[in-house]
């Protein structure tokens, strides 16, 4: 993704169009320290009772252009025997994130902030059993 070019003069923060002229630094800083990411477990997607797969969601007009999204493998959950339990459902946990979307045909490139729902994993919940009246 391209970065919004810096204007020669700082925009006036009191001007009505201030937010249309903000330069965004797209460098990603790991404020928690480098060690944190190495502890992030990647095998939960297989060990979970509601396992999921990850898909590489690509949008060249978005920043970040690559987002890895979870999708539940099954509608049901997996029991201790490795069989699907029809009393339990696999549901996607979604997180709302902010992304930058490139404005079409804009030159130089400008971005708008958009909300995006991203699947981050799956969890197991009890099925809703509807009793006959």
């Amino acid at each position: 993704a391209a970065i919004i070019p810096q204007s020669s003069a700082c925009p006036n923060t009191e001007a009505k169009d201030f937010l249309q002229n903000v330069k965004v630094n797209l460098k990603v800083f790991n404020s928690l320290g480098a060690k944190v990411s190495s502890r992030r477990p990647s095998d939960y997607l297989n060990r979970s009772t509601s396992p999921w797969t990850l898909h590489r969601n690509e949008d060249p007009d978005r920043y970040p252009s690559v987002i890895w999204e979870a999708q539940c493998r099954h509608q049901r959950c997996v029991n201790a025997e490795g069989k699907l339990d029809h009393h339990m459902n696999s549901v996607l946990i979604q997180q709302e994130i902010l992304v930058l979307k490139r404005e079409p045909e804009s030159c130089p490139f400008t971005f708008r902030v958009e909300k995006m729902l991203v699947g981050v994993g799956c969890t197991c919940v009890a099925s809703i059993v509807r009793q006959a009246a």
Partner: antibody, heavy 119, light 107 residues
Amino acid sequence: EVQLVQSGAEVKKPGASVKVSCKASGYTFTDYEFHWVRQAPGQGLEWIGVIHPGNGGTAYNQNFRDRATLTADKSTSTAYMELSSLRSEDTAVYYCTRFLTYEGYFDYWGQGTLVTVSS
Amino acid sequence: NIVMTQSPSSLSASVGDRVTITCKASQSVSIDVGWFQQKPGKSPKLLIYHASNRYTGVPSRFSGSGSGTDFTFTISSLQPEDFATYFCQQDYSSPYTFGQGTKLEIK
């Protein structure tokens, strides 16, 4: 200093499988995607697929989806590319390369592994 | 798949010459194009990313330009160490694809 060190050359028979490794050092292994690219003798470069060691996610070029398997071992900071049902046209140099997901480009490459498929 | 058509496939030039290589994408790839240098028996080395940005440590004689479908890579004054093969590559959308390469030889 960032380094990607690949395993040595392999000679395989048609129908066999090969597993190439790529050991990373000098940065946090789980932070960046690993892509695999191959180059047949005298030919251009062909993208095979990608793995994100941080979350285990993979994506493949349609041409390799049925035969290539990408894995990563966080404990040794090593990425692997396994190619099955080898045929003579798979003879190539296989490269691993680090992709800066946010910036959007390949920066470091392994030295390459020559895989020769011959009966 | 996006096809990257690179030309010329080979080129003879002398030290000090200005050399230009072009790459044409089969559809718009915005500015998501990189240029690589590869010497025999070696892995590719990134020179230019996002069409016109020089990678860290790359000499200023290497430059790139273009957007959409047409891209240009220029070496302003050839040095002896520049004789190699050069590739363009798009990372706009997967499968990521490469040009067939331009072999730059000494005249």
